[in-house]
């Protein structure tokens, strides 16, 4: 999906008012310095691409993030503010239903959510120069 035509300010507002705290709660008990940010993004569409990938695509050691509250809210926000997003995701969801995983919090998942927090922070500050 091409995130170029999303309403970025509305997504930012959704993140600040309904998503960010759930990421913090997921990470509770973890030191903010525990994980290094290794995933970066260069502009808002790119940030959303990376956010979508880290949130919804199962990875080795962390297969269950897509079932977390912050993931559901992300999915809902993208569906509303990214034209055509919901249509492109319907087929993907049917495939995902067949391999539904139970929610497990592993160290790998914590690292992944830490990366997500970094991506969202970057998304919210698009005018900052890339480090």
């Amino acid at each position: 999906y091409d995130f170029t035509n999303c309403d970025f300010e509305k997504i930012k507002a959704a993140y600040l008012s309904t998503i960010s705290k759930d990421l913090i709660t997921y990470m509770s008990g973890t030191k903010s310095t525990e994980f290094n940010n290794t995933v970066s993004c260069s502009n808002r569409p790119h940030c959303l691409t990376e956010i979508q990938s880290l949130t919804f695509n199962p990875t080795a050691g962390c297969a269950s993030l897509a079932k977390e509250m912050f993931a559901m809210k992300t999915k809902a926000a993208l569906a509303i503010w990214c034209p055509g997003y919901s249509e492109t995701q319907i087929n993907a969801t049917q495939a995902m239903k067949k391999r539904r995983k139970r929610k497990v919090t592993t160290n790998k998942c914590l690292e992944q959510v830490s990366q997500l927090q970094g991506l969202w922070r970057r998304f919210n500050r698009p005018l900052l120069k890339q480090q």
Epitope: T18, K21, D22, I24, T25, K67, M69, A76, Q89
Partner: antibody, heavy 116, light 108 residues
Framework: QVQLVESGGLVQPGGSLRLSCAAS????????MSWVRQAPGKGLEWVSG???????YYADSVKGRFTISRDNSKNTLYLQMNSLRAEDTAVYYC???????????WGQGTLVTVSS | DIELTQPPSVSVAPGQTARISCGGD??????VYWYQQKPGQAPVLVIY???KRPSGIPERFSGSNSGNTATLTISGTQAEDEADYYC???????????FGGGTKLTVL
């Protein structure tokens, strides 16, 4: 303007009923939609919700008896209610659940009475 | 699912400040929403994301949330604010929406 209009009715205990909710004024197919009920003189109780892609969630009190569905081409939300009990008597609200976690638009509500 | 606890009733004199509490385990780690419901009407969202007001909601409505308690504050309460108020959050395990039992606000 944004509008949700429900239809309901009277049914006997053990019977079935399907509620409908016609949505207008917004891109229905993009939104997570839900049903909330309110028994006479009681508080609000969330019943069920459904994503644009058909992913569903249910309150424990209705799991296995109620089925939520939607027809995005008709901008309509449904609630199929089976094995109805007297305690299911309530006003049922169709609701647009913003960002999966709160309700920003409510229908006017429809009274479902389960009585013999 | 988590349980949200509200006082059944709160009374306030016109022009005074009304505070309605909503208690729940680690509630500060989740977002809280508040709805106003007048007799025979559907609920109306008055606070979202703990403390934000939807457009059209008067400035006298405000919200806060920390620890195990969220609070809806109505400053300079008016007669028209008399209604039932419900807090709402969600369960992080089931992902279901959860409502408090509701508080009847009486403006004396």
């Amino acid at each position: 303007q944004v509008q949700l209009v429900e239809s309901g009715g009277l049914v006997q205990p053990g019977g079935s009923l399907r509620l409908s909710c016609a949505a207008s004024g917004f891109t229905f197919s993009s939104y997570y939609m839900s049903w909330v009920r309110q028994a006479p003189g009681k508080g609000l109780e969330w019943v069920s919700g459904i994503f644009f892609d058909g992913t569903t969630y249910y309150a424990d009190s209705v799991k296995g008896r109620f089925t939520i569905s939607r027809d995005n081409s008709k901008n309509t939300l449904y609630l199929q209610m089976n094995s109805l009990r007297a305690e299911d008597t309530a006003v049922y609200y169709c609701a647009r659940q913003q960002y999966f976690d709160h309700i920003d638009i409510w229908g006017q509500g429809t009274l479902v009475t389960v009585s013999s | 699912d988590i349980e949200l606890t509200q006082p059944p009733s709160v009374s306030v004199a016109p022009g005074q400040t009304a505070r309605i509490s909503c208690g729940g385990d680690s509630l500060g780690g989740k977002y809280v929403y508040w709805y106003q419901q007048k007799p025979g009407q559907a609920p109306v969202l008055v606070i979202y994301g703990d403390s934000k007001r939807p457009s059209g909601i008067p400035e006298r409505f405000s919200g806060s949330n920390s620890g195990n308690t969220a609070t809806l504050t109505i400053s300079g309460t008016q007669a028209e604010d008399e209604a039932d108020y419900y807090c709402q959050s969600y369960d992080l395990k089931s992902l279901n929406v959860v409502f408090g039992g509701g508080t009847k606000l009486t403006v004396l």
